[in-house]
């Protein structure tokens, strides 16, 4: 039961995380105009990965896409790539994890196959989360660097007569959405990996037992040639869980609202 819950929760957390990564990637507010130096601006600028926007005094917002590919900073391209890789891996991970869910039966799929799929999706979620966190962090670092550079430019070489207020950008909402979403995907992936350990059918660890047959003094160890390893073959059709061996019927779970997507 604990394994099913862990797997199910990992799936749901990852699903929320990936939805967040997609949302963050699409959001326009990766960087927003810093209002510290100009709190009374009637024209508010903010930028995303795909376009930059200006909200004017009338309340109208005009957004313009970055229609050039070669003219964009390499860092922005890298962030785009990281976020897209994160989304793709996450989406594949979600697809794999749906089939790996213990509460969903697909034909006569072996538990070992489900365990492998759970592990695969877990690893995909972890990498997806890391990609998102990395992408957002690279962008944040870029913002911090530019912020201090523009601050330095603001107060130098103008002889105290600063007429043009240079627009500085600070962290936008998308960065926080991305960090949280990446973290959730990462946690979901870890949970899937933990669930995988519980799903994997292990061999039962039997202690060597001495059988005293009449007229002979020979010690037999069950498991044939495996006797030397101390593991016997698990001949009964049971799954080995962290909490002990249980039959499949004992861990029957009822479908929850998260089981079918």
């Amino acid at each position: 039961m604990a394994v099913t819950a862990c797997q199910g929760l990992g799936f749901v957390v990852s699903l929320i995380g990936i939805a967040g990564i997609i949302a963050a990637t699409c959001m326009d507010q990766w960087s927003t105009q810093d209002l510290y130096n100009n709190p009374v601006t009637a024209v508010f600028n903010y930028q995303g990965l795909w376009r930059s926007c200006v909200r004017e005094s009338s309340g109208f917002t005009e957004c313009r896409g970055y229609f050039t590919l070669l003219g964009l900073p390499a860092m922005l391209q890298a962030v785009r790539a990281l976020m897209i890789v994160g989304i793709v891996l996450g989406a594949i991970g979600l697809l794999v994890s749906i089939f790996a869910l213990k509460c969903i039966r697909i034909g006569s799929m072996e538990d070992s196959a489900k365990a492998n799929m759970t592990l695969t999706s877990g690893i995909m979620f972890i990498v997806s989360g890391l990609c998102a966190i990395a992408g957002v962090s690279v962008f944040a670092n870029m913002l911090v660097t530019n912020f201090w550079m523009s601050t330095a430019n603001m107060y130098t070489g103008m002889g105290g007569m600063v007429q043009t207020v240079q627009t500085r950008y600070t962290f936008g909402a998308a960065l926080f959405v991305g960090w949280v979403a990446g973290g959730l995907t990462l946690i979901g992936g870890v949970m899937m990996c933990i669930a995988c350990r519980g799903l994997a059918p292990e061999e039962t660890n039997y202690k060597a037992v001495s059988y005293h047959a009449s007229g002979h003094s020979v010690a037999y160890k069950p498991g044939g040639f495996k006797a030397s390893t101390g593991f016997g073959s698990n001949t009964k059709n049971k799954k080995i869980y962290d909490g002990g061996a249980r039959t499949e019927d004992e861990v029957q779970s009822y479908p929850s609202k998260h089981d079918y997507v």
């Epitope: 600028n45 930059s52 005094s57 005009e62 043009t164």
Partner: antibody, heavy 115, light 113 residues
Framework: QVQLVQSGAEVKKPGASVKVSCKAS????????VHWVRQAPGQGLEWMGY????????KYNEKFKGRVTMTRDTSTSTVYMELSSLRSEDTAVYYC????????WGQGTLVTVSS | DIVMTQSPDSLAVSLGERATISCKSS????????????LTWYQQKPGQAPKLLIY???TRESGVPDRFSGSGSGTDFTLTISSVQAEDVAVYFC?????????FGGGTKVEIK
């Protein structure tokens, strides 16, 4: 077509309050801020503030803070501007304006403050 | 607050002549986000509400005759009427649309000689 129709002229005594209405039509009311500007007789234009009909957010000119209140009624697409503690120098034509670059203005409401 | 200074206060020109109105702002109105100057020009005829002529310092509003043109960037702007017509008699205002409080120039009255 886009229209901003304002309420009629008002005559008020000093110390009183006036509430001017501005009914918008011909566009999505919540998409654009509604600003208020006044013009004293023979004088220039003075910005008073705005209201965002979408979320009721307001921003006022410091000069009028504490005296001006802007409200809206989305059901009738109407914005109200109330100016309190009226003085003789508040005698002016009050305009509401909206849309991009303030392409549309109301016809103006003359508020006369006299004892 | 950004101070908008218009000159001259009044201008008398003959029909068909060129009229030039200057507007200076105490701070730059150039928005680095889209490289646009947030300066607007309005025309106000006697007894009427102001009418939008030019936005972004140089973009003519639709329906405005092409004899009206705007130029300038940063802090110095100009409105030009290339060939003044009788219907152009009005007061012209420039407006800072970049920073609150939004501020207007004192106005320039254009008359026919």
């Amino acid at each position: 077509q886009v229209q901003l129709v304002q309420s009629g002229a008002e005559v008020k005594k000093p110390g009183a309050s006036v509430k001017v209405s501005c009914k918008a039509s011909g566009y999505t009311f919540t998409n654009y801020f509604v600003h208020w500007v006044r013009q004293a007789p023979g004088q220039g234009l003075e910005w008073m503030g705005y209201i965002n009909p979408y979320n009721d957010d307001t921003k006022y000119n410091e000069k009028f803070k504490g005296r001006v209140t802007m409200t809206r009624d989305t059901s009738t697409s109407t914005v109200y501007m109330e100016l309190s503690s009226l003085r003789s120098e508040d005698t002016a034509v009050y305009y509401c304006l909206s849309l991009r670059f303030f392409a549309y203005w109301g016809q103006g409401t003359l508020v006369t403050v006299s004892s | 607050d950004i101070v908008m200074t218009q000159s001259p206060d009044s201008l008398a020109v003959s029909l068909g002549e060129r009229a030039t109105i200057s507007c200076k702002s105490s701070q730059s109105l150039l928005n680095s986000g889209n490289q646009k100057n947030y300066l607007t020009w309005y025309q106000q005829k006697p007894g009427q509400a102001p009418k939008l002529l030019i936005y972004w310092a140089s973009t003519r509003e639709s329906g405005v005759p092409d004899r009206f043109s705007g130029s300038g960037s940063g802090t110095d702007f100009t409105l030009t009427i290339s060939s003044v017509q009788a219907e152009d008699v009005a007061v012209y205002f420039c407006q800072n649309d970049y920073s609150y409080p939004l501020t207007f120039g004192g106005g320039t009255k254009v008359e026919i000689k």
